[in-house]
């Protein structure tokens, strides 16, 4: 039985040209997490995180993408075709698969405002 | 070259405990979780539980919740099983087996068994 | 919690026979099955995992099929060497648990 709980940075803006972590936890469960995958809007997929292999960041996103924070991802030099949806999926024993949702806004304006909140889908 | 090598094995008399040993090689201990499995004479196997390698935190499965301990030296790259307050019922051998961190999650390596006797 | 059913609990060939095992799963379990062969004295060895993925260095005579809650262990020719006993595996979910086991004989 999946126990578990994804909490992520919920819905997020920031400004065109800065950068934005984007954040999931997994909690309320001891399953180990053996790999995590970022996906963006369109489904591809931004970067792996596997615990034997280490992190894996894609071609198309390897000037922009940082690992890290812990199992989080950094998006830096933003456009505005950043904006949409983004998914963190954990892959975990013995519960299997956890998923979790972040809308990312990418604002033109110079005094918009970074704003997260830890929050349950 | 990945391996599990578990400790010899073991005679005991009932009420006795018994530390079992499985020392891991040639990958990162804590990235894999690592399971128990019980094989009586004659039987088949029988799915012990499992330790999170990356927490410590162990994992039972229904019938070895009591008498049963899973844990952990990553210094020594080792996991243990422990049993007390033996029975003759407990007489087995004992496997430690690594989870695979595919999306499936089959046992990849084994170690090559410990078998534990019980008897006065 | 999800039972496996696996028969036969024995079965007798002969060398170059077709031989067919059953593990059959009391709810769905997706493809997260594995099966195991284990030889006299010696430890398990993984020989599928997902239901129908070869694990690296297995002979190619053996092979896995899924149907619903019905998964198929098949020896395509049997060999001296496959003298063992065969487990499936559950796989999704604590707790994972084994099929009862197929001895596999040669005539």
């Known amino acids: 039985m999946m126990t578990g709980t994804i909490e992520t940075t919920g819905n997020i803006s920031a400004k065109k040209g800065g950068s934005v972590i984007l954040q999931c936890h997994l909690s309320s469960t001891m399953a180990q997490v053996t790999q995590v995958n970022w996906e963006q809007h369109d489904h591809s997929l931004l970067a792996i995180r596997n615990a034997e292999l280490g992190w894996h960041i894609y071609p198309a996103f390897k000037d922009r993408v940082a690992p890290g924070p812990g199992l989080g991802l950094t998006l830096q030099s933003l456009t505005m075709n950043d904006t949409g949806e983004y998914f963190c999926t954990y892959h975990t024993y013995p519960d299997g698969t956890y998923r979790g949702r972040i809308f990312l806004e990418v604002l033109e304006s110079s005094v918009a405002e970074h704003s997260a909140r830890f929050q349950i889908p | 070259e990945v391996q599990l090598v578990q400790s010899g094995s073991e005679l005991k008399k009932p009420g006795a405990s018994v530390k079992v040993s499985c020392k891991a090689s040639?990958?990162?201990?804590?990235?894999?979780?690592m399971n128990w499995v019980r094989q009586a004479p004659g039987r088949g196997l029988e799915w012990m539980g499992w330790?999170?390698?990356?927490?410590?935190?162990?994992a039972y499965a229904q019938d070895f919740t009591e008498r049963f301990v899973f844990s952990l030296d990553t210094s020594v790259t080792t996991a243990y099983l422990q049993i007390s307050s033996l029975k003759a019922e407990d007489t087995a051998v004992y496997y430690c087996?690594?989870?695979?961190?595919?999306?499936?999650?089959?046992?990849?390596?084994w170690g090559q068994g410990t078998l534990v006797t019980v008897s006065s | 919690d999800i039972q496996l059913t696996q028969s036969p609990s024995f079965l007798s060939a002969s060398v170059g026979d077709r031989v067919t095992i059953t593990c059959r799963a009391s709810?769905?379990?997706?493809?997260?099955l594995a099966w195991y062969q284990q030889k006299p004295g010696k430890a398990p060895r993984v020989l599928i995992y997902?239901?129908?993925t070869l694990q690296s260095g297995v002979p190619s005579r053996f092979s896995g099929s899924e149907s619903g809650t019905e998964f198929t262990l098949t020896i395509s020719s049997l060999q001296p060497e496959d003298l063992a006993t065969y487990y499936c595996q559950k796989l999704n979910s604590h707790p994972s648990s084994f099929g009862q086991g197929t001895k596999v004989e040669i005539k």
């Open positions: 997902g239901a129908t």
């Open positions: 709810q769905g379990i997706s493809s997260y």
């Open positions: 040639g990958y990162t201990l804590t990235n894999y979780p």
């Open positions: 087996a690594r989870t695979a961190i595919t999306s499936v999650y089959h046992f990849d390596y």
């Open positions: 330790i999170n390698t990356n927490t410590g935190s162990p």
